[in-house]
């Protein structure tokens, strides 16, 4: 029978954090500073991602893994791998092209990002409003009106610190 000789690629022995250096007889050389190889057998190391400007470093680059970025305070990440930073707003606001705007009456936002959403319509579930909504909080639905004992109030006003959700646009 004919013996087949397996030609193993010498570069396959190079571990993560190194590259197969063609200029040095394919020996495994460490990745230069600010570069990495996350898998073995690579012929080059990749430049690390640079967390610059609005981005700040969440995880430093190492010889075997890329840097990871997040956003500077006042911003939050968007996109795959935090490829963009979006301005934060306050609770009770949403971000528009012209900046942060208060939620319209009947809507709320309980986060620093995202859009204002309509208050829950309790009556759709046959329930009544237990606590009024604000710009920052949804309404709280309670038992249906029929479940309430005569003379009981069906609406509890929000805590004094919270003003009812109304904002002129």
């Amino acid at each position: 029978f004919e013996r087949t000789r397996s030609l193993q690629d010498p570069c396959s022995n190079c571990p993560a954090g190194t590259f197969c250096d063609n200029n040095r007889n394919q020996i495994c050389s460490p990745c230069p500073p600010n570069s990495f190889s996350s898998a073995g057998g690579q012929r080059t190391c990749d430049i690390c991602r640079q967390c610059k400007g609005v981005f700040r470093t969440r995880k430093e680059c190492s010889s075997t893994s890329n840097a990871e970025c997040d956003c500077t305070p006042g911003f939050h990440c968007l996109g795959a791998g935090c490829s963009m930073c979006e301005q934060d707003c306050k609770q009770g606001q949403e971000l528009t092209k012209k900046g942060c705007k208060d939620c319209c009456f009947g809507t709320f936002n309980d986060q620093k990002r995202g859009i204002c959403r309509p208050w829950t319509n309790c009556s759709l579930d046959g329930k009544s409003v237990l606590v009024n909504g604000t710009k920052e909080r949804d309404v709280v639905c309670g038992p249906s009106p029929a479940d309430l004992s005569p003379g009981a109030s069906s609406v509890t006003p929000p805590a004094p610190a919270r003003e009812p959700g109304h904002s002129p646009q």
């Epitope: 430049i47 400007g53 609005v54 956003c71 911003f75 791998g81 490829s83 979006e86 528009t96």
Partner: antibody
């Protein structure tokens, strides 16, 4: 409305220096997240990024030009500057000032550009 | 440094044509890629950011796709005002631009 207006271009002798200015309006150079930079374009050629400074005063330079460039800003005047030394004929270009990011989403792109200022290096 | 190579460097097309321009990065850059349009004597104008997001006010006939090393700018139906030079730009490490693609009238 965001506006960037460059000035300081003109005819410069080889070996000399130039200092370009970029007056910003409609936003503050010191607002968190904001970065503003310089990009140039030689006649009939493509765009070449030169330098950028961010609100935290971190500075970034093109490796090939780092030794000849200085980027700075004056927050009180809301103005950006670029100093380029040891000028050569190949530095002849239109120099643009540009702001990083868009209105509410910021990243590593340039949404706002000035009209550019022409620098000619010749004896 | 990270290099960006655009192809073709120039192309001729007619109004109504679908036009595709590609940009290849010398290594993976995630989605850190933007596209610009530039007309003679004018500053560049941002079209697409983060590889596929259309900048406000840019017509929907422009679209971007890709991630990693290969990116595409597509103009679905070329209009007279679209004849210009287009540049890609990466922001993964520092900032660099492609060499440009000139779209001319056939």
């Amino acid at each position: 409305e965001v506006q960037l207006v460059e000035s300081g271009g003109g005819l410069v002798q080889p070996g000399g220096s130039l200092r370009l200015s970029c007056a910003a309006s409609g936003f503050s150079l010191s607002t968190g997240g904001v970065g503003v930079g310089w990009i140039r374009q030689a006649p009939g050629k493509g765009l070449e990024w030169l330098a950028l400074i961010d609100w935290a005063d971190d500075k970034y330079y093109s490796p090939s030009l780092k030794s000849r460039l200085t980027i700075s800003r004056d927050n009180s005047k809301n103005t950006l500057y670029l100093q380029l030394n040891s000028l050569r004929a190949e530095d002849t270009a239109v120099y643009y000032c540009a702001r990083g990011g868009s209105d509410t989403v910021i990243g590593d792109w340039f949404a706002y550009w000035g009209q550019g200022t022409l620098v000619t290096v010749s004896s | 440094d990270i290099q960006l190579t655009q192809s073709p460097s120039s192309l001729s097309a007619s109004v109504g044509d679908r036009v595709t321009i590609t940009c290849r990065a010398s290594q993976s850059i995630g989605s850190y890629l933007a596209w610009y349009q530039q007309k003679p004597g004018k500053a560049p104008k941002l079209l697409i950011y983060d590889a596929s997001n259309l900048e406000t006010g840019v017509p929907s006939r422009f679209s971007g796709s890709g991630s990693g090393t290969d990116f595409t700018l597509t103009i679905s139906s070329l209009q007279p005002e679209d004849f210009a030079t287009y540049y890609c730009q990466q922001g993964y490490y520092l900032w660099t631009f492609g060499q440009g693609t000139k779209v001319e009238i056939k």
